[in-house]
Every structure is written in structure tokens, then in C-alpha cells.
Interface confidence: medium
Amino acid sequence: AITEAREEAKPYPLFPGPLPGSLQTDHTSLLSLPHTSGYQPALMFSPTQPGRPYTGNVAIPRVTSAGSKLLPPLAFKHTVGHIILSEHKDVKFNCSISVPNIYQDTTISWWKDGKELLGAHHAITQFYPDDEVTAIIASFSITSVQRSDNGSYICKMKINNEEIVSDPIYIEVQGLPHFTKQPESMNVTRNTAFNLTCQAVGPPEPVNIFWVQNSSRVNEQPEKSPSVLTVPGLTEMAVFSCEAHNDKGLTVSKGVQINIKAIPSPPTEVSIHNSTAHSILISWVPGFDGYSPFRNCSVQVKEVDPLSNGSVMIFNTSASPHMYQIKQLQALANYSIGVSCMNEIGWSAVSPWILASTTEGAPSVAPLNVTVFLNESRDNVDIRWMKPLTKRQAGELVGYRISHVWQSAGISKELLEEVGQNNSRAQISVQVHNATCTVRIAAVTKGGVGPFSDPVKIFIPAHGWVDHAPSSTPAPGNADPVLII
């Protein structure tokens, strides 16, 4: 007879801490099953043999050491094999086994779908010792079951290197259909066929699918899950969903919008970010893409000038970033700029046109006829030049920049002078005697500094002797500047 019922934590109880609704085990003591006198743990176990019933599930002791008693085979008692319940219900199931008291340190572990359950608030093991055997009941409880609890649960026990395995307890959590694949939003070409997929599972099975378009059922007869709906084509946007039905009821998928691809809307808010003499940096806000990704954009540029031929320059660019630097423009010119973008369906209309201007350019030519001569009495160098013929786009001449480089043995230094636009001559002090002075001049406008003239060299002798002949830029056709002493 069972004289005592105990509930203890076994060595290594299976799960941590209590879950609401589960029993609390005492995790502080280690249990050794009572060792009853008269039994010696000297049992022999049958080897595994092909065809032998219960192999791996049953430990079959032969005899006790005294040889007088044959102990019954060790096996978990049969229990319920299949539990069907609804989601969010509680469930409790157990394994039980009677173990002779000669065995010590027995442990029952729970496994689900072939994987050991490494921890559980859910597991409790109770021991009912008698004179010769201890009945062990390992209970497993789950509060508010979910689909993830579906599976095959077994108990395992190790005794003398033999593994005893219980029959599986299959837990089937039933509920409303659960979608494993729902239709996805799509952007489709007008009047072109496309497919939508819907898949749902139980248990319980079967799961049947109805399709819904704009709140109306598409199919009169349900299709077994999974279902593929082929839509021959649409001319306008539609919303599709699917209904999944099983014996527990119905679940409706999310509604998905199927859009019809169209040409994009024109870009808006074309803005000027930066203007130079020959380039303009613009940005724009893309219009609606027409449910199809932008492929590229086109920047259209017209010169606003009564004398221009009215031709349009077109610059193609990627759709992103929404920015483009228009290059190769005339300085000090006015332009009208528009942007259009395209997707796979076609080009958008052009954005509203905006006006933009380039700034003054730098001069494109250097001053002419540069001559240099030494004025020894004043110890300076006279420089003369002719004003360059600049284009209107270069803007108004604001002055000249003179570079003079002084070179003597081991020394070289460059100095820069700025003179006003009304000048066509300048004087610079002699910096070094017995040296060469190299002079170059550039015209300056608000647009910048133009190119420097070809260098003109003059030798500055030591004090006391000098030739006053000038040095000048070469006549056209001469290869090098000349130095006249």
C-alpha cells in the first residue's frame, strides 16, 4: 500500500520557477530514493537485441543478487496518448513509473518533439515510496496553451545506463485558422494577370479559403488551403483579402491593396541651390511615382535670350538623389529649367519651369603686349600692357593682378600686386639686384581671375650698370619671351 505521498524537487527538476497556475516545487533539497535493506543494486540488464519488444523503453532486470526474485520489467505506465484542446485552455498530463528502491538518483526528464525541455515551470515530480518500490509521477502542466505547445511529449529515465522512454503524449492545440501566408500588396500593370496566395493551417484541418475582392466574395466554392487566386487583370485599384474557415470558425486575412501602375506625377519645387559662371545646382521634390519606381529623370534647360535659337538642352540623370548640377552653361546668362521623371510606364509631365542665372565669368584672355623695363634712377621696374578684349559674359573688369618673381643664386620669391581697372601700367620696386625678375599679368573681374600672360623676364644687374631697353612679351609666332639688355 502507498503509505506516504511526497512532493519534492528531484535532483535537477526540469523548469525554473513557478508559472501562474502551476504548482510550486521546493528547489532546495536533493532527493535520494530510499535505499531499502535487503536489496542490493546488482542487477543485470538485457542487452539491446533486434526485434526484442520494449528495447530502449524498458529496463528488464533479471534477478536479485540472492537469485530468489525476478523483478518486473521497468516501464512507464500507459497513459492518454492524444490530448485535443482549444487554444488558451490549461492542460496537465503525466508519466508514471514504479521503481524498485534499490535504484537511487533516478531522474525523469521531459522531451518535446525529440528535444529535451531544459527548464520548465510546468514540471513537477511526486514520489510515493513503499516498502519495495517508489511510485514516481511526473506531471507536466501548461497554462493557456498556444499553438507552439503542439507536439509529442515523452518522459525519459536513466537507470544503470538503460534509458526508459514513455509512450508519447501528443498534444493537439486546436483553434481558429492561423495564416502562414497572406496575400501581399502589389502594384500591377493595367489589364495584366497576377496571382495572390493565401495559406492557413489548423488544427483542426481542413482549412478552406474564400477570396474577397472589394468586400465581395470571388469564389462561390471554397478552396482547400493553400489557395492561389489568379486575377485576369484590373483597370482600377482593388482591395483583396481571404477568409480561412475550419471547424472552430473563421479568420480573415489583412486586406491588401492592388494598385494600377501609371506614369508619375511631375516633380515639384524645383530649387536653385548654387550658381556659378558655368553651372547651376538644382534640386526637386519628386512627384507621386505612379506605383512604379522612378528609373531616371531629365533636366531640361532653355536659354532665355531673344538672340538665342530657343533650343532645349537635355541632361539625363538618375532619379536619386533628387539633385543635379547643370554644367557647360554660358556665364552671365538666364535660363529656364524644368524637370521630368520616368518609371516603367513612361515620362511624367515637366515640372513648373523656373528661372535661373549664371554669374559673371572670369576673363578668358590675358592682357596683351606686356613690356617690362628697369628704371635705375628710381630703383624700380616699369610694367606696361594693353587691356584684353573680354566678352560681356566675363563681366566688368575690376583690375589686374601682377605676379613678379625674383630669382638669384639660391633665392626665389613671388610677390603679387593688385592694380585698378583704369591702369595699363604699374611700377614695382626692385627687390633683389643681380637677379632675374619674371612678370606675368592677369585681368580680374567679379567672376574671378583670368589667365596670366606669358612670362616676361628682365635681368636686374648689380648697382651701377644697366641697359634701359625694355623686355616685352614676344610677338605672335615667337616661341619664348625675350630679354633685352
Epitope: 528531484k10 523548469f15 520557477g17 526528464s109 529535451e116 527548464g119 507552439s148
Partner: antibody, heavy 124, light 107 residues
Framework: EVKLVESGGGLVQPGGSLSLSCAAS????????MTWVRQPPGKALEWLGF??????????EYSASVKGRFTISRDSSQSILYLQMNALRAEDSGTYYC???????????????WGTGTTVTVSS | DIQMTQSPASLSASVGETVTITCRAS??????LAWYQQKQGKSPQLLVY???TLAEGVPSRFSGSGSGTQFSLKINSLQPADFGSYYC?????????FGGGTKLEIK
């Protein structure tokens, strides 16, 4: 004081073998599940396998990445856990830790005590 | 196998701030979740088990929460000793798996 000390790491060529040891002290070694975890340089921790306790026959479980190449065993008398690693690959390089499950395994399969680690480098 | 996804992968914070690290399981793991702290060049240390129970000796500024598939570790009033990497690990069933880690750095 509960203590785990790993040893046996070093440099080994791809395809080679290495055996790591973990000396345990300060607790009843036979009562605990014991595990090996590794950490490649600069990467996350990866569980390799464990050895169940005496009551569960010291049976073993392995991760898919090392199953068939690595073997976990114990010497209960000396309280040593072993990891025998064969057919090593470059991706097996890293720091190898041994750790124990808490004394009441049913308290959960987390790791309450860790060793200091030993470094394994697999390179030609 | 159950996948554990940790976020963010890295985080900068100042001493005294409060930070939260999250961990998501690919399926229901009830409360079978542990958190570990690992400092550079050191072995991991258990911080939290059963999703919210602090391990022995862990300061009360650490707290764990969550169950099912969503979990978080909160550190109040960050101290210099708290900087390092943090890992979550499930132990619902074999194989136990770790998250990819969160590196907590000083701002």
C-alpha cells in the same frame, strides 16, 4: 569556492585535432549538467553541447555545427570535463568556455558559473 | 532551433543614464530566458534568469522583464562597471541559443 578552469587551447592546423579540459572544484561535479560555449573573436557566444549529470547517465547533446566532430566526456573521479575537437576548421577559432547548469537542473538550463576560457586558433 | 534576436547591436550611453536592451525569441519560450554580462577579455557572468530573477550579487539597478517572445533588460543609473557586452539566452529546450549581443559603450 566554485571554480572552473579550462586548459588545452593553442594553435592547430585545419583538419587537426585538439582536446580541451575543464577542471571543476567547489561543488559536486556529478550532480550538474556541464556545458561548453565558444566565442569567435569579436562575435557572439555559441553553445556547443552539454553533458548531462550522473542521474542522466552523463549523456550528451551537441549543436548542429559541431555534431560528429566534437565529443564531450567527463572524468568524474577527477572532476574534469573534456572537449575533444576533430576535423578543425578556421571558423572553429575563438575562446572556449566551460560552464555549469545550476545545481538543480530543473531550476533551468542557464549557466550560473563560467570558466575563464581557453583560446583555440585554427590556421595554416 | 529557436532564434534569439537582440537589439540594438550597439549602444552609447553616459554614466547615470538608463538603458534598455531587448531580446526577441522566434517562438514562445515562456520565461526561460537568461541575461549575461561580458566585459572585454573576461568570461560572461549570469545577471538574470527566469526572465526577471536577479542572480546572486547582481545590483538592483538591473532588472529583467517579459515573457513569451519579447524580453528586455533595463539598467538604471549606469555605472562605469556596467559597460561591456550583454547577451540573452533561451533555455526552453535543446539547443539553448544566445542572442547576437549588445555592446554598451561609454558616450
Amino acid at each position: 569556492e566554485v571554480k572552473l578552469v579550462e586548459s588545452g587551447g593553442g594553435l592547430v592546423q585545419p583538419g587537426g585535432s585538439l582536446s580541451l579540459s575543464c577542471a571543476a572544484s567547489g561543488f559536486t561535479f556529478t550532480d550538474n549538467y556541464m556545458t561548453w560555449v565558444r566565442q569567435p573573436p569579436g562575435k557572439a557566444l555559441e553553445w556547443l553541447g552539454f553533458s548531462r549529470n550522473k542521474a542522466n547517465g552523463y549523456t550528451t547533446e551537441y549543436s548542429a555545427s559541431v555534431k560528429g566532430r566534437f565529443t564531450i566526456s567527463r572524468d568524474s573521479s577527477q572532476s574534469i570535463l573534456y572537449l575533444q575537437m576533430n576535423a578543425l576548421r578556421a571558423e572553429d577559432s575563438g575562446t572556449y568556455y566551460c560552464a555549469r547548469f545550476p545545481p538543480h537542473y530543473y531550476a533551468g538550463g542557464y549557466f550560473d558559473v563560467w570558466g575563464t576560457g581557453t583560446t583555440v586558433t585554427v590556421s595554416s | 532551433d529557436i532564434q534569439m534576436t537582440q537589439s540594438p547591436a550597439s549602444l552609447s550611453a553616459s554614466v547615470g543614464e538608463t538603458v534598455t536592451i531587448t531580446c526577441r525569441a522566434s517562438e514562445n519560450i515562456y520565461s526561460y530566458l537568461a541575461w549575461y554580462q561580458q566585459k572585454q577579455g573576461k568570461s560572461p557572468q549570469l545577471l538574470v534568469y527566469n526572465a526577471k530573477t536577479l542572480a546572486e550579487g547582481v545590483p538592483s539597478r538591473f532588472s529583467g522583464s517579459g515573457s513569451g517572445t519579447q524580453f528586455s533588460l533595463k539598467i538604471n543609473s549606469l555605472q562605469p562597471a556596467d559597460f561591456g557586452s550583454y547577451y540573452c539566452q533561451h533555455y526552453y529546450r535543446t539547443p539553448p541559443t544566445f542572442g547576437g549581443g549588445t555592446k554598451l559603450e561609454i558616450k
